[in-house]
């Protein structure tokens, strides 16, 4: 789970060790702040929980790509 170190910065200290299907993911944001110990991706899940993931992992990259495409595709 991400930790807020102050009102403006949220950091991840541990990553999930289990892949989550993209069907269970709603959105994501990247953590690149120099105030944080590591770069991370925070996924917001369909049940509004935030989960820290390692951006180097393929499933994380694939999930971000999928969510990007979803956002770009207009709902008809």
């Amino acid at each position: 789970q991400p930790d807020a170190i102050n009102a403006a910065v949220t950091c991840c200290y541990n990553f999930t060790n289990r892949k989550i299907s993209v069907q269970r993911l709603a959105s994501y944001r990247r953590i690149t702040s120099s105030k944080c110990p590591k770069e991370a991706v925070i996924f917001k899940t369909i049940v509004a929980k935030e989960i820290c993931a390692d951006p180097k992992q393929k499933w994380v990259q694939d999930s971000m790509d999928h969510l990007d495409k979803q956002t770009q595709t207009p709902k008809t």
């Epitope: 299907s21 069907q23 899940t45 049940v47 929980k49």
Partner: antibody, heavy 119, light 109 residues
Framework: QVQLVQSGAEVKKPGSSVKVSCKAS????????ISWVRQAPGQGLEWMGG????????NYAQKFQGRVTITADESTSTAYMELSSLRSEDTAVYYC????????????WGQGTLVTVSS | EIVLTQSPATLSLSPGERATLSCRAS???????LAWYQQKPGQAPRLLIY???DRAEGVPARFSGSGSGTDFTLTISSLEPEDFAVYYC??????????FGQGTKVEIK
């Protein structure tokens, strides 16, 4: 340790309804769902449907659509399964089971509730 | 709906032997979202394996799962007396549509 405790055995007449409860303790209800699975005597497991309490909506197997209603009360950490228009083929043990909504495997199960439908 | 077909229906083996149970899906099971359960008479099922190959907490190392796509296997490396039971596979790709296989009974030969 998570525990799911179900209501007791029921004997029902054909055409009536039954409502089975499942109370969860020892864990959060927040990002979890409850599935209902039944098992007729000598038969396999059959998924009936499930609910994720924070969604306030349930999903049902096509076979039970229109005859089953699954609900959950977050304030009491209790899920309910109501089956209507009972027939003898509905005689079975009904289980509730918990799953993490991020995944789906059923990690904790209730003890089961025997529902007997007989005239 | 994804249909899971388990084989064989019954497996007759002796303690100490290796058991290999199969579960075949009618469609690709993405993310290997497949679990295995053990059920003994008069008891609720117990989770053994999730995500096709990960052992649940407290499950002995003699149980292992493998497979991906449409073909999955549960292996019990050396049967103990308490392993004689019915085993079910379960797919959970879609939260709105879970399905189980019909079960494989592992009985004493």
């Amino acid at each position: 340790q998570v525990q799911l405790v179900q209501s007791g055995a029921e004997v029902k007449k054909p055409g009536s309804s039954v409502k089975v409860s499942c109370k969860a303790s020892g864990g959060t209800f927040s990002h979890y769902g409850i599935s209902w699975v039944r098992q007729a005597p000598g038969q396999g497991l059959e998924w009936m449907g499930g609910v994720i309490p924070i969604f306030h909506t349930a999903n049902y197997a096509q076979k039970f659509q229109g005859r089953v209603t699954i609900t959950a009360d977050e304030s009491t950490s209790t899920a309910y399964m109501e089956l209507s228009s009972l027939r003898s083929e509905d005689t079975a043990v009904y289980y509730c089971a918990r799953y993490d909504a991020h995944y789906g495997e059923l990690d904790f199960w209730g003890q089961g509730t025997l529902v007997t439908v007989s005239s | 709906e994804i249909v899971l077909t388990q084989s064989p229906a019954t497996l007759s083996l002796s303690p100490g032997e290796r058991a290999t149970l199969s579960c075949r899906a009618s469609q690709h099971v993405s993310d290997a979202y497949l679990a295995w359960y053990q059920q003994k008479p008069g008891q609720a099922p117990r989770l053994l394996i999730y995500d096709a190959s990960d052992r649940a907490e407290g499950v002995p190392a003699r149980f292992s799962g493998s497979g991906s796509g449409t073909d999955f296997t549960l292996t019990i490396s050396s049967l103990e007396p308490e392993d004689f039971a019915v085993y079910y596979c379960h797919q959970y790709i879609h939260l709105h549509s879970f399905t189980f296989g019909q079960g494989t009974k592992v009985e004493i030969k």
